[in-house]
């Protein structure tokens, strides 16, 4: 799915007016992008409790298990993002897969992901049938990680 | 940083011809987006060996430590991506932070990230000064996670 851009316009780049309305399917086809989390959502029921499974996807087998929570915005590219929610405060024991080990903390790994928002172009509200894609950094939790607690100097 | 898009064009969307050359700073300002991995690169020297540190960034304190490797393409948005490279085959013991525990595997968490490539528009090579943004899914390893080995049924 491609988006045509014209080089050399004042605002990188500015495009032509048009009489017709873009069909909503077009924008959504372009924006819907990846609508799946790193691990298949169909399996995430495994990871809804504080235990490390011996099968299923990675987020449920981790000793810092997590679930995925959907974040949907139809005016954003990608439209669907997933946030990892840690299911345990501490890491689960490798031996038992269920008891927590206070020596390890289960913590989210955050990342500022590049996203694009569909916006009216600055100073053009209502005048042209054009829109802007505004680049933003959006904070998402990617996964939960088992770490040794930080020792303060 | 915004990108102006015209609604309603046949190819979502098609833009106007222009005589002037786009300055490289403009495209790169728009594409460079997040040029940092989830954890500061300045600290990644902590995580270059198979041990779990008691300080430093999350990737070095994890019992499945990893380092970040740069993936750069000036024709992609975002221009810089970071891949996690696991530094240990097994998880590091929470007690010692150095000895590996064969009960746990340190494995990469993969994700198909939405990216955009700057391309000549289809069938227009050399004829117009316009380009297309092509949406693609690009596989990156986000982090390394300590998991219980999969038990086959």
């Amino acid at each position: 799915v491609s988006l045509r851009i014209q080089e050399g316009c004042s605002h990188l780049p500015s495009c032509c007016p048009s009489k017709e309305q873009e069909p909503p399917e077009e924008w959504l086809k372009w924006s819907s992008a990846s609508v799946s989390p790193p691990e298949p959502l169909s399996h995430t029921h495994h990871a809804e409790s504080c235990r490390a499974s011996k099968d299923g996807p990675l987020n449920s087998r981790a000793i810092s298990p997590w679930s995925y929570e959907l974040d949907r915005d139809l005016n954003r590219v990608p439209q669907d993002l997933y946030h990892a929610r840690c299911l345990c405060p501490h890491c689960v024991s490798l031996q038992t897969g269920s008891h927590m080990d206070p020596l390890g903390n289960s913590v989210p790994l955050y990342h500022n992901q590049t996203v694009f928002y569909r916006r009216p172009c600055h100073g053009e509200e209502g005048t042209h049938r054009r829109y802007c894609l505004e680049r933003r950094l959006y904070r998402v939790s990617l996964a939960c990680v088992c770490v040794r607690p930080r020792v303060m100097a | 940083v915004s990108l102006r898009i015209q609604e309603g064009c046949s190819h979502l969307p098609s833009c106007c011809p222009s005589k002037e050359q786009e300055p490289p700073e403009e495209w790169l300002k728009w594409s460079s987006a997040s040029v940092s991995p989830p954890e500061p690169l300045s600290h990644t020297h902590h995580a270059e060996s198979c041990r779990a540190s008691k300080d430093g960034p999350l990737n070095s304190r994890a019992i499945s430590p990893w380092s970040y490797e740069l993936d750069r393409d000036l024709n992609r948005v975002p221009q810089d991506l970071y891949h996690a490279r696991c530094l240990c085959p097994h998880c590091v013991s929470l007690q010692t932070g150095s000895h590996m525990d064969p009960l746990g595997n340190s494995v990469p968490l993969y994700h198909n990230q939405t990216v955009f490539y700057r391309r000549p528009c289809h069938g227009e090579e050399g004829t117009h000064r316009r380009y297309c943004l092509e949406r693609r899914l690009y596989r990156v390893s986000l982090a390394c996670v300590c998991v219980r080995p999969r038990v086959m049924a």
Partner: antibody, heavy 125, light 108 residues
Framework: QVTLKESGPTLVKPTQTLTLTCTFS??????????LGWIRQPPGKALEWLAH???????HYKPALKSRLTITKDTSKNQVVLTMTNVDPVDTATYYC?????????????????WGQGTLVTVSS | DIQLTQSPSFLSASVGDRVTITCSAS?????MYWYQQKPGKAPKPLIY???NLASGVPSRFSGSGSGTEYTLTISSMQPEDFATYYC???????????FGQGTKLEIK
């Protein structure tokens, strides 16, 4: 116009450190998208990429030589320096510096569009 | 690392001949670049991004290909075309530039 010129020793002893300088004009290495690389060519053999430095000081090295190479830039002097430690006779080659950073309407090219004339370095005791 | 294999390594041709040099990548790549090198000289860019001619390059040179197979074609050999030709690619992860082993084009 764009010019690049390599300079450095013509003869180096094994185990020593080789330092090569590329002095360029006609462009600025602080321009977004601009990069400069080092390529070598042993006598009668193929081209081999060694290292690259971008406008924003990000550096890349050939994985097999990474531990021996260091690339740095001095934007104010229009110079890029490559150092190679622990040289061996197999490092005998013509060393070229070359520019990358041409932006077309369709994007950046990863070709080296301007090259220096090269400098022959012999490693021998 | 992606490997590039050029074939043939040596090629004898006559003035007026149509010549094709191929470059095979060990895995799929987006674009290929081509250079011409004459003895004692630095390489000179011929083809950008698979099929775009570099400035000043005669139209008898052309490039094509996709995926793992790329070709450089000289439609009618001229005396000044006898040289060594190299293909090159850029790989974004890890960021590396790779050259083929070269094709030496000689007068038959």
């Amino acid at each position: 116009q764009v010019t690049l010129k390599e300079s450095g020793p013509t003869l180096v002893k094994p185990t020593q450190t080789l330092t090569l300088t590329c002095t360029f004009s006609g462009f600025s290495l602080s321009t977004s998208g601009m990069g400069l690389g080092w390529i070598r060519q042993p006598p009668g053999k193929a081209l081999e990429w060694l290292a690259h430095i971008w406008w924003d000081d990000v550096k890349h090295y050939k994985p097999a030589l990474k531990s021996r190479l260091t690339i740095t830039k001095d934007t104010s002097k229009n110079q890029v320096v490559l150092t190679m430690t622990n040289v061996d006779p197999v490092d005998t080659a013509t060393y070229y510096c070359a520019r990358m950073g041409q932006l077309h309407y369709y994007g950046y090219d990863y070709a080296m569009d301007y090259w220096g004339q090269g400098t022959l370095v012999t490693v021998s005791s | 690392d992606i490997q590039l294999t050029q074939s043939p390594s040596f090629l004898s041709a006559s003035v007026g001949d149509r010549v094709t040099i191929t470059c095979s990548a060990s895995s799929s790549v987006s674009y290929m670049y081509w250079y011409q090198q004459k003895p004692g000289k630095a390489p000179k860019p011929l083809i950008y991004r698979t099929s775009n001619l570099a400035s000043g390059v005669p139209s008898r040179f052309s490039g094509s290909g996709s995926g793992t197979e790329y070709t450089l074609t000289i439609s009618s050999m001229q005396p000044e075309d006898f040289a060594t030709y190299y293909c090159q690619l850029y790989h974004s992860y890890p960021p590396t530039w790779t050259f083929g082993q070269g094709t030496k084009l000689e007068i038959k």
